[in-house]
Interface confidence: medium
């Protein structure tokens, strides 16, 4: 199709070679044709529409991304081209930042029901660069953790070095919402609650003498409890002692609750105690068998192919830990009669 | 007992000024509500004027009409909540309740005042 | 700012009668969304917060549905004490705060 008279749209993607981060291309069409399938509320009722209102389906997915390449080939589908790249709804979804990621990307309606409909579409001419040089030390992060029920805040990265007063007016999206009334390089949560959880985007204008660039970064936004101010306790096993059949294998499984830390390095391993002696044992990894905001339960087995005499001498003791503390607990093997 | 009261309604000319003050009692000020000013036009509806929260944030949130004309302000160490009217209209007459919304989930107004007549008029 | 529609502006019903109120949000607001009770003379009443929650101490004939844009207030069986005027509110504030609006109200009044 004949992308002349597609709307055009310039951004900029400065990305950090430090960390990960991801990046959204919007399907900005015009209004009114956008709210007939994306129901996305997001150019002010003062925005004229640029073309006639596009006459499309209500599928939230009913758009088609494309890219131009640069050679002049034929516009190609994103979906069949570009793993890296994703689309959700109305959104692309960048998954990893690279200037191979630079170019004009095309969002259409996939179904094309008036004559009017065929201008119904943007071209975005995406930059990508990284950051040259380190000028803002502390810029924010692509990755920011609210507290529950704390007040706290999300920064634009690319705007975090500015002061309020320096910074020109943002644009924020909350997972691909507009935010209307916020303004500022940084918004304000007086008290965060799960809902503030979500990927942020944050928009200004860039101009030169020749053009203007918008200017978009990415935030992806937790919502955490505090950090856990106890040791890790051990669920199982709760006995200290465990019977068992002589030559048949044995499963022991220790299962120990994790407090939430930011910095998350939890250790949990089992060990043998024989007499004086204690070795470490190479036993399956751990694995999380249940994750909630507050806490991990984290476990781990020792397996045994065949239970020995020497093994009813044996202690089998768990060791869990975290930043704060460890603890254990020993489990000895006894015969199991009749 | 839980209570707001509302006081400062007063006749005023039209371009005057009044300042609404709502003194609370029961609860504490620094705890983390939304205190907002809800106005409502004799025989019409409720209206939004304003809201602060009285978290560390102290954010402020206008209804767009007020923005300019009104200012929303609090004083934690009398527990005492503040609407500062300015350059008032004839529209402006109207009840002005105080109300404390929760500060989770979108804060609903579980307390309200019993209002404060404002009349503009020459 | 948000506007909230609500309908009917005022309704006529009988004790028993089963009651329903809309109210219409221009843009999302999720489930943040309240609905009071008003008496002549007396402040608002909450009975029901984040749109379907209803509030300790008001009668289980109150009940609310709805999210996003589209809400709804029920009275399964309307009582003597009923007849009031009903207003809907966005409740959203921080982040997702558009405007702590309210609808225009419905009046219930007795046929």
């Known amino acids: 199709f004949n992308i002349s008279g597609c709307s055009t749209k310039k951004l900029l993607w400065t990305y950090s070679t430090r960390s990960e981060e991801e990046f959204v291309l919007f399907c900005d069409l015009p209004e009114p044709q956008k709210s007939h399938f994306c129901h996305r509320n997001r150019l002010s009722p003062k925005q004229v529409p640029e073309h006639l209102p596009f006459m499309g389906s209500n599928d939230l997915s009913d758009v088609q991304w494309y890219q131009q390449p640069s050679n002049g080939d034929p516009l190609e589908d994103i979906r069949k081209s570009y793993p890296h790249i994703i689309q959700d709804k109305c959104t692309l979804h960048f998954l990893t930042p690279g200037v191979n990621n630079s170019g004009s990307y095309i969002c259409r309606p996939k179904m094309i029901k008036s004559p009017y409909d065929v201008a119904c579409c943007v071209k975005m001419i995406l930059e990508v660069k990284p950051q040259t040089n380190a000028s803002c030390e502390y810029s924010a992060s692509h990755k920011q953790d609210l507290l529950l029920g704390s007040t706290g805040s999300i920064s634009c990265p690319s705007l975090s070095c500015q002061s309020d007063a320096q910074s020109p007016a943002v644009t924020w999206y909350k997972n691909g919402k507009l935010l209307s009334v916020e303004r500022s390089n940084r918004i304000v949560v007086d008290e965060v609650y799960d809902y503030h959880q979500g990927t942020y985007v944050c928009d200004y204008t860039q101009s030169d003498t020749v053009s203007s660039w918008t200017v978009r970064a990415v935030v992806q936004v937790r919502t955490i409890v505090g950090d856990t101010k106890l040791k890790p306790d051990i669920l199982d096993p709760v006995e200290d002692t465990l019977e068992v059949e002589l030559g048949k294998p044995l499963t022991i499984s220790c299962k120990a609750r994790f407090g939430f830390e930011r910095v998350f390095n939890p250790v949990i391993k089992w060990y043998i105690k024989d007499s004086d002696l204690e070795w470490e044992v190479s036993v399956p990894e751990a694995k999380s068998i249940k994750s909630t905001l507050k806490d991990e339960i984290i476990e781990r087995n020792i397996i045994l192919e065949k239970v020995t005499q020497r093994d009813l001498r044996r202690k089998f003791v768990c060791f869990v830990q975290n930043s704060i503390g460890n603890t254990t607990q020993s489990v000895q093997l006894k015969e199991k009669r009749g | 007992e839980v209570q707001l009261e509302e006081s400062g309604g007063d006749l005023v000319q039209p371009g005057g000024s009044l300042r609404l003050s709502c003194a609370a009692s029961?609860?504490?000020?620094?705890?983390?509500?939304?205190m907002c000013w809800v106005r409502q036009a004799p025989g019409k509806g409720l209206e939004w004027v304003a809201c602060?929260?009285?978290?560390?944030?102290?954010?402020?949130y206008y209804a767009s009409w007020a923005k300019g004309r009104f200012t929303i302000s609090k004083d934690t160490s009398k527990n005492t909540l503040y609407l500062q009217m300015n350059s008032l209209r004839a529209e402006d007459t109207a009840v002005y309740f105080c109300?404390?919304?929760?500060?989770?989930?979108?804060?609903?107004?579980?307390?309200w005042g019993q209002g404060t007549l404002v009349t503009v008029s020459s | 700012d948000i506007q909230m529609t609500q309908s009917p502006s005022s309704l006529s019903a009988s004790v028993g009668d089963r009651v329903t109120i809309t109210c219409q949000a221009t843009?999302?607001?999720?489930?943040?969304l309240a609905w009071y009770q008003q008496k002549p003379g007396q402040a608002p009443k909450l009975l029901i917060y984040?749109?379907?929650t209803l509030e300790s101490g008001v009668p289980s004939r109150f009940s609310g549905s709805g999210s996003g844009t589209d809400f709804t207030l029920t009275i399964s069986s309307l009582q003597p004490e009923d007849f009031a005027t009903y207003y809907c509110?966005?409740?959203?504030?921080?982040?997702?705060?558009?405007?702590?609006?309210f609808g225009g109200g419905t009046k219930v009044v007795i046929k």
């Open positions: 109300a404390r919304g929760a500060g989770s989930y979108g804060g609903a107004v579980r307390l």
């Open positions: 984040r749109a379907s």
């Open positions: 843009e999302d607001i999720e489930s943040f």
């Open positions: 509110q966005c409740t959203v504030y921080g982040v997702n705060f558009v405007a702590n609006a």
């Open positions: 602060i929260y009285t978290g560390s944030s102290g954010s402020t």
């Open positions: 029961g609860f504490d000020f620094s705890s983390n509500y939304y």
